[in-house]
């Protein structure tokens, strides 16, 4: 039975050229996290964090994606094309799969303020 919930940073905005942290947190379960996958809006896999074998970043994103903090992901040198949905998928044992959604808006404006809050999708 899946008792856990995924909390995410929800809808966030950040400046073009800046960086942003995508964060998901799994709570209310004792399940063991075996792997976390981070996907972009077009179903492309950005990164994997495997419990035994560590972080793997897709080579095309290596210069702009940094692992962490924790099981989160840091996107750097943001472009307007980075706007869109991001998904964290937590594979756990024995619960199964949990999935969270974050929407990132990259703003052209130099006065854009980074906004982030944790919410349950």
């Amino acid at each position: 039975m899946m008792t856990g919930t995924i909390e995410t940073t929800g809808n966030i905005s950040a400046k073009k050229g800046g960086s942003v942290i995508l964060q998901c947190h799994l709570s209310s379960t004792m399940a063991q996290v075996t792997q976390v996958n981070w996907e972009q809006h077009d179903h492309s896999l950005l990164a994997i964090r495997n419990a035994e074998l560590g972080w793997h970043i897709y080579p095309a994103f290596k210069d702009r994606v940094a692992p962490g903090p924790g099981l989160g992901l840091t996107l750097q040198s943001l472009t307007m094309n980075d706007t869109g949905e991001y998904f964290c998928t937590y594979h756990t044992y024995p619960d199964g799969t949990y999935r969270g959604r974050i929407f990132l808006e990259v703003l052209e404006s130099s006065v854009a303020e980074h906004s982030a809050r944790f919410q349950i999708p």
Epitope: T34, Q35, N37, H43, L45, I48, N50, L53, G54, H56, I57, Y58, P59, H91, T97
Partner: antibody, heavy 117, light 106 residues
Framework: EVQLVQSGAEVKKPGASVKVSCKAS????????IYWVRQAPGQRLEIIGR????????YYVDKFKNRATLTADTSASTAYMELSSLRSEDTAVYYC??????????WGQGTLVTVSS | DIQLTQSPSFLSASVGDRVTITCKGS??????LVWYQQKPGKAPKLLIY???NLQSGIPSRFSGSGSGTEYTLTISSLQPEDFATYFC????????FGQGTKVEIK
């Protein structure tokens, strides 16, 4: 052209150790992690662990945590896998392979390790 | 981790045959599936990545398809050099391999 060339076959006695080498060429050795994978007769491939040559950081599957040691010599573009306390069930072909993001794109030719008394 | 089961384990075929190999996951593989070819004493060769992307230099007679838990590798017209063992690999949950399918000459 990317190539991974492994050392030759080994025959070892139970309780001994074996060290297999994997020389990389055709790419920047420190840019990609090297995985070690083995295939015992009639069995599927199983992962032993991973080394990042850039910083020497290693990761091991639980099953091999206490017996496998992965190292890399960046000056020689060579990765090594040492397995200790060998037993008959360690008889297998051992492969080094480069991981491209999430999947393995180039493999060594394999090294047969036979454990027999 | 996801367990992968290939079928059949052995396959006898003739040159020119259309050959299909199946790889089934114990859970959703989410299209993160890869196919390799291996000949005796040789290094495995990457054929297809992410379900249906042909690796550079691989002949177009090889193709991949599938979704969810079920994936297939198809060789449209088997050539003499295609007699080999084929195995699948997934990275959606853990990094695991299928047991292999040996394609033999009929």
């Amino acid at each position: 052209e990317v190539q991974l060339v492994q050392s030759g076959a080994e025959v070892k006695k139970p309780g001994a150790s074996v060290k297999v080498s994997c020389k990389a060429s055709g790419y920047t050795f420190t840019e990609y992690s090297i995985y070690w994978v083995r295939q015992a007769p009639g069995q599927r491939l199983e992962i032993i662990g991973r080394i990042d040559p850039k910083n020497g950081r290693t990761y091991y599957v639980d099953k091999f945590k206490n017996r496998a040691t992965l190292t890399a010599d960046t000056s020689a573009s060579t990765a090594y896998m040492e397995l200790s306390s060998l037993r008959s069930e360690d008889t297998a072909v051992y492969y080094c392979t480069r991981i491209y993001g999430f999947y393995f794109d180039f493999w060594g030719q394999g090294t047969l390790v036979t454990v027999s008394s | 981790d996801i367990q992968l089961t290939q079928s059949p384990s052995f396959l006898s075929a003739s040159v020119g045959d259309r050959v299909t190999i199946t790889c089934k996951g114990s859970q959703n593989v989410n299209k993160y599936l890869v196919w390799y070819q291996q000949k005796p004493g040789k290094a495995p060769k990457l054929l297809i990545y992410n379900t249906d992307n042909l690796q550079s230099g691989i002949p177009s007679r090889f193709s991949g398809s599938g979704s969810g838990t079920e994936y297939t590798l198809t060789i449209s017209s088997l050539q003499p050099e295609d007699f080999a063992t084929y195995f699948c690999y997934q990275y959606n949950n853990g990094f695991t391999f299928g047991q292999g399918t040996k394609v033999e000459i009929k």
